[in-house]
Interface confidence: low
């Protein structure tokens, strides 16, 4: 496929990803795949810098990313490694807790309204950030 | 420019109560997270307590859970720090301080009220 | 709980002088450490957050550095201001701990 060298419209360009912020509300797996479709992925945050730049865009706005725990330990989408990389859980969290009454535990991470991260119910509605990467290969056929 | 001002220390036998006040301006205090810190005379620093910027979620160091409470009001832009049941090495200066919105750090501190528990 | 240990205790030396501190965490706390500077009878101020990052108008001359366990803050020149007592904090869960502190006199 052809290399992607400038961001989407209505995408933001910062450190050579771009970003898309949703203003609606859709379910973690809904969103993931909303990403997909757009030929990106749920973000992936691997600093504090990136962290900070999401943190802006998002507000304090309950938002879906690229982190679960689904299939027992946490993983990052994009399949960056989880336990050497950036983190920024609330202090106590993730507890994966079953006291919300809505079955199973949480195991879906979120930025919180003060940016730190929650994990909670996979299935409530919060809005999500999509990222990709740019100068990677698009998913496109080249235009013959 | 942000303020944090402490009031309500002073001199409480062993045994009794005192309500600390941390009185905020400059910033927007319903966005963020407060803390208070307390030093004894000549010692380190030592972290109380924290409350969320909504009041949702408080925690406390050992030595004083079930004996202090914080609290906030956000409509008055004031922290506070009930403290029941003072002993005498409650002792210290008490600061509040805020909390960046990223991580628990703390990126503007008050002056400090001094408590001195002794009979 | 996560234990700060800082070393030393205290220092002297000399303006001009290059003075590291260094901090350990009892586990692993990753970026998750802070460093203030006190002066007798004031509050704390924040010198550094996240390990390495300068907070906003502290001189360049301060600056740190490690993650994981192993954390040190350094002052490439000392300056007469800069005589204090300098803390780490960890910030990765509660209840957040502070090192014992680095009082850094004039020699």
């Known amino acids: 496929g052809s290399e992607r060298t400038c961001c989407p419209v209505n995408w933001v360009e910062h450190e050579r990803s771009c970003y898309w912020f949703s203003r609606s509300g859709k379910a973690w797996a809904d969103a993931d795949n909303y990403c997909r479709l757009e030929d990106a992925h749920l973000v992936v945050v691997t600093s504090w810098e990136e962290q900070k730049f999401v943190q802006h865009h998002i507000g304090p706005v309950n938002t879906w990313m690229g982190l679960h725990d689904q299939n027992g330990p946490w993983k990052w989408v994009d399949g960056t490694d989880y336990e050497t990389g950036f983190k920024n859980w609330r202090p106590e969290q993730p507890d994966d807790w079953y006291g919300h009454g809505l079955g199973g535990g949480e195991d879906c991470a979120h930025f919180t309204d003060d940016g730190r991260w929650n994990d909670d119910v996979c299935q409530r509605p919060y809005r999500w950030v999509c990222e990709t990467e740019l100068d990677k290969a698009s998913q496109e056929p080249p235009l013959l | 420019q942000v303020q944090l001002v402490e009031s309500g220390g002073g001199v409480v036998q062993p045994g009794r109560s005192l309500r600390l006040s941390c009185a905020a301006s400059?910033?927007?205090?319903?966005?963020?997270?407060m803390h208070w810190v307390r030093q004894a005379p000549g010692k380190g620093l030592e972290w109380v307590a924290v409350i969320w910027h909504d009041g949702s979620n408080k925690y406390y160091v050992d030595s004083v859970k079930g004996r202090f409470t914080i609290s906030r009001d956000n409509s008055k832009n004031t922290l506070y720090l009930q403290m029941n049941s003072l002993r005498a090495e409650d002792t210290a200066v008490y600061y509040c301080?805020?909390?960046?919105?990223?991580?628990?750090?703390?990126?503007?501190w008050g002056q400090g009220t001094l408590v001195t528990v002794s009979s | 709980d996560i234990q700060m240990t800082q070393s030393p205790s205290s220092l002297s030396a000399s303006v001009g002088d290059r003075v590291t501190i260094t901090c350990r965490a009892s586990q692993n706390i990753y970026s998750y450490l802070n460093w203030y500077q006190q002066k007798p009878g004031k509050d704390p101020k924040l010198l550094i957050y996240a390990a390495s990052s300068l907070h906003s108008g502290v001189p360049s001359r301060f600056s740190g550095s490690g993650s994981g366990t192993d954390f040190t803050l350094t002052i490439s020149s000392l300056q007469p201001e800069d005589f204090a007592t300098y803390y780490c904090q960890q910030s990765y869960s509660t209840p957040l701990t502070f090192g014992g502190g680095t009082k850094v006199e004039i020699k």
């Open positions: 301080a805020r909390e960046n919105s990223s991580s628990y750090y703390f990126d503007y």
């Open positions: 400059g910033f927007t205090f319903s966005y963020y997270g």
